[in-house]
């Protein structure tokens, strides 16, 4: 059982009409609207992933019988990285503690390929959603959660990190893509614009969100974060899109009412457990999936993403609280802490549904270049 | 026999300050939450605040009614729980309970044990 | 907040009788929902948790159920010493809130 939320079945970027229709152009701003980042200068270039950090920059996975009993990953794989290159950041480097990954910032110096070799590799994240061209894959099942409604206690660390704010969960959080590729969810955190500017970090037709949800989950067939980093499937992460509607989200209040407590960089409060899939959306069966990269340094790839194509409304006053609260290190506030998105040099964004089927009057001829590859493999 | 036992309430003028203190015995103390709550003449309840298990921090939560203003501790050494009450408002008058919440092994917020209660006069 | 609303907010029944009160909640709580009972110049005594848990050493006339946002408690042969204000109480998320109060009498 859920806790109340806002338009369940608001599809990506169709507002609060409540059908869930696949995604249609008409639906979106025109690119005029809203520019799409121009590629990173030269990242062909770059050197690949070869040299990704080893396992002592990264943290442990702790067992459970450790104090807490919670998966700490709280400097790591956090999905996270920097904005549009028209868009300069002034905020968010990493928490000081001493990882080789440390120093990075959104939109600054210096470049994420020298903080990790990786970040300059082919097959980064985010990347533009193009409907279109998403080959459909009968094969992508609806998505599997499993525990995913704690109690209220035990509490949940919630903590800005100086680049988002992070909710640490606890063991127990089961997640499936498909029969045999299982998970255990690790930690959720978000990104946002600022007024006026959104800041998902994936696009759909290039238009981007107000802000997006993102769910980070180890492999069951590794035991720890930095075993997983760089290997095929090691990493999963499901990530939503945050859209204004007309009322509060309940689920969502239980995490945004604590964020002044947390606003100074560094800084954290302890909060109730609670639905954990009452943060994303209701359908889990219509959902777009590809392989790309962690959004921050250190961008390891062989990430599987999972981009719901529903939405999940919060009230305007909560989407300004969510970009308007927390400070990032040198006085800044914490905004618009989302990558540039990365080109898919060939990659497939598989959907499991017929996202490239339209029914707009303008698309009288679906395009549908690509076929499903690998789904449910 | 599990028993937490209130003192320090009485009369004041607003404005002024009061330390409420709750002692505990027949439970191991340093493994739960502890709270405040009260209740104003002849209505209902309200929590007041809480402060965490040393396994938590020892961190402090409090209703907005009395944030900034009252003030939960604890010393475990001494089982015993307090409350710091500045800038008394008329509003504040009630009867204040110490009542203990959860701990590392429960998964609920409830109160399961209350003391009898101690009582908080705010009037000029 | 989580707004709490008790119904009725007082009631006259008989002894045997099966009484029953409601609390319903603003907002989805799950089964995070406590019943405690007051009795004049007596500290509230915790009776269900959970919605549906008698705490121990509540007599088992006493019960609970529901989930989500509405909840029901429930006395199944009214006994003379159940004369008290019962409240719910929402475990969900802080602040914790508490419902109005519902005062039961003897007819």
């Known amino acids: 059982q859920r806790l109340p939320r806002m338009q369940e079945d608001s599809p990506l970027g169709g507002g609060s009409s409540g059908e869930d229709d696949p995604l249609g152009e008409e639906d979106l701003p025109s690119e005029e609207d809203s520019p799409r980042e121009e590629d990173p200068p030269g990242e062909e270039d770059l050197p690949g992933e070869e040299d990704l950090p080893g396992e002592e920059d990264l943290p442990e996975v702790k067992p459970k019988s450790e104090e807490e009993g919670s998966l700490k990953l709280e400097d790591l794989p956090t999905v996270e990285a920097p904005g549009d290159p028209q868009e300069p950041q002034n905020n968010a480097h990493r928490d000081k503690e001493g990882d080789d990954q440390s120093h990075w910032r959104y939109g600054g110096d210096p470049p994420w390929p020298r903080v990790s070799p990786a970040c300059a590799g082919r097959f980064q994240s985010p990347v533009d959603i193009r409907p279109q061209l998403a080959a459909f894959c009968p094969a992508l099942r609806p998505l599997e959660l499993l525990g995913f409604q704690l109690p209220p206690l035990p509490e949940l660390r919630l903590r800005n990190n100086g680049h988002s704010v992070q909710l640490t969960l606890p063991p127990g959080l089961e997640m499936a893509l498909g029969p045999g590729r299982e998970y255990r969810a690790l930690q959720l955190h978000l990104h946002w614009g600022a007024a006026g500017r959104p800041g998902s970090e994936h696009t759909v037709e290039g238009h981007r969100f107000p802000a997006e949800i993102h769910v980070v989950h180890l492999s069951t067939a590794f035991a720890r974060v930095d075993e997983a980093l760089g290997r095929p499937g090691g990493l999963a992460v499901l990530a939503a899109f945050l859209e204004e509607g007309p009322e509060e989200n309940s689920a969502y209040e239980q995490l945004l009412s604590r964020l002044e407590e947390i606003a100074e960089e560094g800084s954290e409060t302890q909060v109730p457990g609670l639905d954990i899939s009452a943060l994303l959306p209701s359908d889990f069966s219509r959902y777009f999936q590809y392989e790309g990269s962690l959004t921050t340094p250190p961008c390891a790839q062989g990430v599987i993403w999972t981009v719901f194509n529903q939405t999940v409304m919060l009230s305007a006053k909560q989407l300004h609280t969510l970009s308007d609260t927390l400070w990032g290190p040198g006085d800044s506030r914490l905004q618009l802490n989302f990558r540039a998105t990365q080109p898919l040099n060939g990659r497939v964004i598989e959907a499991s549904f017929p996202a490239g089927v339209d029914s707009s009057p303008r698309a009288a001829e679906p395009v549908q270049l690509n076929s499903c590859l690998a789904a449910g493999d | 026999e599990v028993q937490l036992v209130e003192s320090g309430g009485g009369l004041v003028q607003p404005g002024g300050s009061l330390r409420l203190s709750c002692a505990a015995s027949g439970f191991t103390f340093t493994d739960y939450y502890m709270h405040w709550v009260r209740q104003a003449p002849g209505k209902g309840l309200e929590w007041v605040a809480f402060?965490?298990?040393?396994?938590?921090?020892?961190?402090?939560q409090y209703s907005a009614s009395v944030k900034g203003r009252f003030t939960i501790s604890r010393d475990d050494s001494k089982n015993s729980l307090y409350l710091q009450m500045n800038s008394l408002k008329i509003e504040d008058t009630a009867v204040y309970y110490c009542v203990r919440g959860g701990h590392a092994g429960s998964n609920y917020w409830y109160f399961d044990v209350w003391g009898q209660g101690t009582t908080v006069t705010v009037s000029s | 907040d989580i707004q709490m609303t008790q119904s009725p907010s007082s009631l006259s029944a008989s002894v045997g009788d099966r009484v029953t009160i409601t609390c319903h909640v603003s907002q989805n709580i799950n089964v995070w929902l406590s019943w405690y009972q007051q009795k004049p110049g007596k500290a509230p005594k915790l009776l269900i948790y959970?919605?549906?848990n008698l705490h121990t050493g509540v007599p088992s006339r006493f019960s609970g159920s529901g989930s989500g946002t509405d909840f029901t408690f429930t006395i199944s042969s009214l006994q003379p010493e159940d004369i008290a204000t019962y409240y719910c109480q929402q475990g969900q998320s802080y602040p914790f809130t508490f419902g109005q109060g519902t005062k039961l009498e003897i007819k």
């Open positions: 402060i965490r298990n040393k396994a938590s921090g020892y961190t402090p």
């Open positions: 959970q919605a549906s």
